[in-house]
Interface confidence: low
């Protein structure tokens, strides 16, 4: 003979010694019917705020307040948003590895520094985890016996400069 608790709907609880489906009391929920107890609803407080309020059939869902982000399944922890120079990983905020940077607050991923040499430019300022490399002007390389024509401002005559 089937126990009547098996027919209970979500939002109810049922005790086998008294197989009657009863509604979950306030601030509790049951997502599966026929359980002997309803679960206590999660309270979102402190660094948490309610994303979804508790109902008799679903637990509350929390999210983190401004300036913090969730960690863990179902947002079990709030961690301060990543600073510039960091990126968010599954383990939380991690400092950008050497050669990468993130200049954004709270968001973004670490991106590689600009390779100045690809454009034939020098490095003016080394990059940091927060800032990209600053490239200088193109590096001028003279080949042997290059002739440079120099025309003084306001003067029509050019001077030829032999670089040996």
């Amino acid at each position: 003979v089937q126990n009547s608790c098996d027919n209970c709907q979500p939002g109810t609880f049922c005790r086998k010694y008294n197989p009657v489906c009863k509604s979950c009391p306030p601030s509790t929920f049951s997502s599966i019917g026929g359980q002997p107890n309803c679960n206590i609803c999660r309270v979102c407080a402190g660094y948490f705020r309610f994303k979804k309020f508790c109902s008799s059939t679903h637990n509350a869902e929390c999210e983190c307040i401004e300036g913090f982000h969730c960690l863990g399944p179902q947002c079990t922890r709030c961690e301060k948003d990543c600073r510039p120079g960091q990126e968010l990983t599954k383990q939380g905020c991690k400092t950008c590895s050497l050669g990468t940077f993130n200049d954004q607050n709270g968001t973004g991923v670490c991106r590689p520094w600009t390779n100045c040499s690809l454009d034939g430019r020098s490095v003016l300022k080394t990059g940091t985890t927060e800032k990209d490399v600053v490239c200088g002007p193109p590096v001028v390389s003279f080949s042997p016996s290059t002739t440079i024509s120099v025309t003084p401002e306001g003067g029509p005559g050019g001077h030829s400069l032999q670089v040996l």
């Epitope: 120079g85 400092t95 050497l98 020098s122 490095v123 003016l124 300022k125 080394t126 940091t128 985890t129 927060e130 800032k131 600053v134 200088g136």
Partner: antibody
């Protein structure tokens, strides 16, 4: 010849603002790639990096002190400055300024340091 | 922040001795480590940068080695003028951090 010299108040009281000046010669903070850094050393303890200022007025601060530090420069004099607000006895230290080498981001020339005592 | 642990904190050696000072980083800093020398009442002086590049004017008895997390400054033959405090600096990541220093004395 590159030289740097720090100057400051010597002694000040808790909650006051510490103003430090680094007067340098032999290089210009308007030269691309150059910077000046401030570092401190409490008596008998290790060195602590505080802040950098670069030729283009870009600034870097130690995150643990960021809200109390302000670094600035005057290229015409030429000088770099550091302000530390709301000082405490823990800020008692020798304060150094140093030049940052272009293309490598490390300090090559340092000043002699200036002793600052915070006492009530 | 990356912690830099320097050892020993105090060292007594004789003229002509081979002296080694170690610096250990709490995480990989590649080769971005400098060594500085500070004599009493003087400004710190850059000896080595990026582990083993010697600053101009530094005597060849000084050398640097290591990579990753473990670094060494070696003085091949200690001279009286080498009496000073030596400290390391990592500039791999921000904030840059220093070792606690090694005070070197003559026996």
């Amino acid at each position: 010849q590159v030289t740097l010299k720090e100057s400051g108040p010597g002694i000040l009281q808790p909650s006051q603002t510490l103003s430090l000046t680094c007067t340098f010669s032999g290089f210009s903070l308007s030269t691309d790639g150059l910077g000046v850094t401030w570092i401190r050393q409490p008596s008998g303890k290790g060195l602590e990096w505080l802040a950098n200022i670069w030729w283009d007025d870009d600034k870097d601060y130690n995150p643990s002190l960021k809200n109390r530090l302000t670094i600035s420069k005057d290229t015409s004099n030429p000088q770099a400055f550091l302000k530390i607000t709301n000082v405490d006895t823990a800020d008692t230290a020798t304060y150094y300024c140093a030049r940052i080498v272009p293309n490598s981001g490390h300090e090559d020339y340092w000043g002699q340091g200036v002793m600052v005592i915070v006492s009530s | 922040d990356i912690q830099m642990t320097q050892s020993p904190s105090f060292l007594s050696a004789s003229v002509g001795d081979r002296v080694t000072i170690n610096c250990k980083a709490s995480q990989n800093i590649n080769r971005y480590l400098n060594w500085y020398q500070q004599k009493l009442g003087e400004a710190p002086k850059l000896l080595m940068y990026n582990t083993n590049s010697m600053q101009t004017g530094i005597p060849s008895r000084f050398s640097g080695s290591g990579s990753g997390t473990d670094f060494t400054l070696t003085i091949s033959s200690l001279q009286p003028e080498d009496v000073a405090t030596y400290f390391c600096l990592q500039h791999n990541s921000w904030p840059r951090t220093f070792g606690g220093g090694t005070k070197l004395e003559l026996k």
